[in-house]
């Protein structure tokens, strides 16, 4: 494939990455799949600077990111190491709360209204953010 040198239409470029901000809601797994079909992934927050950028664009709205602990350890969807990476949890979070009455705990992370992170039931239909790196090989064949 060819290297992507600029962002697709309706995506926002920032620090050599492209971001797409949804305006509708999906369950975490559906949002994850949506991003993958766009040759991207749910946003992976690696710095305070990136956190502020995303926060500015999403506003005070619950929004999925690419972080989950559905198989035990917290994992970023692109393989970025959770343990050594940037974290911005709300105080007392993550708490794997069971009191929602929906069954099971809380396995998926989202931005809350103040931008800090919370774990929640993955089935909730929140907005989401896709991210793709500019310099990575595109899946599309090069133009002849």
């Amino acid at each position: 494939g060819s290297e992507r040198t600029c962002c697709p239409v309706n995506w926002v470029e920032h620090e050599r990455s492209c971001y797409w901000f949804s305006r509708s809601g999906k369950a975490w797994a559906d949002a994850d799949n949506y991003c993958r079909l766009e040759d991207a992934h749910l946003v992976v927050v690696t710095s305070w600077e990136e956190q502020k950028f995303v926060q500015h664009h999403i506003g005070p709205v619950n929004t999925w990111m690419g972080l989950h602990d559905q198989n035990g350890p917290w994992k970023w969807v692109d393989g970025t190491d959770y343990e050594t990476g940037f974290k911005n949890w709300r105080p007392e979070q993550p708490d794997d709360w069971y009191g929602h009455g929906l069954g099971g705990g809380e396995d998926c992370a989202h931005f809350t209204d103040d931008g800090r992170w919370n774990d929640d039931v993955c089935q909730r239909p929140y907005r989401w953010v896709c991210e793709t790196e500019l310099d990575k090989a595109s899946q599309e064949p090069p133009l002849l």
Epitope: D69, G72, P73, P94, G104
Partner: antibody
Framework: EVQLVESGGGLVKPGGSLRLSCAAS????????MNWVRQAPGKGLEWVSS????????YYPDSVKGRFTISRDNAKNSLYLQMNSLRAEDTAVYYC???????WGQGTLVTVSS | DIQMTQSPSYLSASVGDRVTITCRAS??????LGWYQQKPGKAPKRLIY???SLQSGVPSRFSGSGSGTEFTLTISSLQPEDFATYYC?????????FGGGTKVEIK
């Protein structure tokens, strides 16, 4: 690498108390719910208690409620189980486990006998 | 409380056999179930999470299926190191509950 090491087990008389500890390493301790699970000699596994990452939520089965107290110290990466009013039926190997059992310690034996 | 009924309690099988263990929940727990293997004197080890997802590092001969109230752990071709006791665990709600266990022995 995730490591969980239990300690504090031993022989105690009925009605006595014991405090188990679990030292965790290799992961961001405060991000995870932690659990105690026990296994009586020759028997199956029994969940004993859970505590959320910041200690906001504590859970117990009826069999230990009011007698056992789970706690944690995130600054020390440590999980605890204070066991009071111990009974013979509390005799078991006690395991510390992370989240929903993706990682386990090696266990510590608690024997309640006169 | 949610009861987990596991069957059979004991199972005799030979190397190469296909082995199936079942757990039945007393109410719908969706896919909030894990399967664990335990060998004598050792801590349990998780094989399957969310009913059907294989834990990293676990051989592909292990598989999980089911949702709701009926769950199955299958070992497609039993190996010598698979002789152990297997447990299911529901984490749909507290109190968390284990199945009674299935001891897989050499025939």
């Amino acid at each position: 690498e995730v490591q969980l090491v239990e300690s504090g087990g031993g022989l105690v008389k009925p009605g006595g108390s014991l405090r188990l500890s679990c030292a965790a390493s290799g992961f961001t301790f405060s991000s995870y719910t932690m659990n105690w699970v026990r296994q009586a000699p020759g028997k199956g596994l029994e969940w004993v208690s859970s505590i959320s990452g910041s200690s906001s939520y504590l859970y117990y089965p009826d069999s230990v409620k009011g007698r056992f107290t789970i706690s944690r110290d995130n600054a020390k990466n440590s999980l605890y189980l204070q066991m009071n009013s111990l009974r013979a039926e509390d005799t078991a190997v006690y395991y510390c486990a992370r989240d929903r059992g993706s990682s386990w310690g090696q266990g510590t034996l608690v024997t309640v006998s006169s | 409380d949610i009861q987990m009924t596991q069957s059979p309690s004991y199972l005799s099988a030979s190397v190469g056999d296909r082995v199936t263990i079942t757990c039945r929940a007393s109410q719908d727990i969706r896919d909030n179930l894990g399967w664990y293997q335990q060998k004598p004197g050792k801590a349990p080890k998780r094989l399957i999470y969310t009913a059907y997802s294989l834990q990293s590092g676990v051989p592909s001969r292990f598989s999980g299926s089911g949702s709701g109230t009926e769950f199955t752990l299958t070992i497609s071709s039993l190996q010598p190191e698979d002789f152990a006791t297997y447990y299911c665990l529901q984490h749909y709600n507290y109190p968390l509950t284990f199945g009674g266990g299935t001891k897989v022995e050499i025939k």
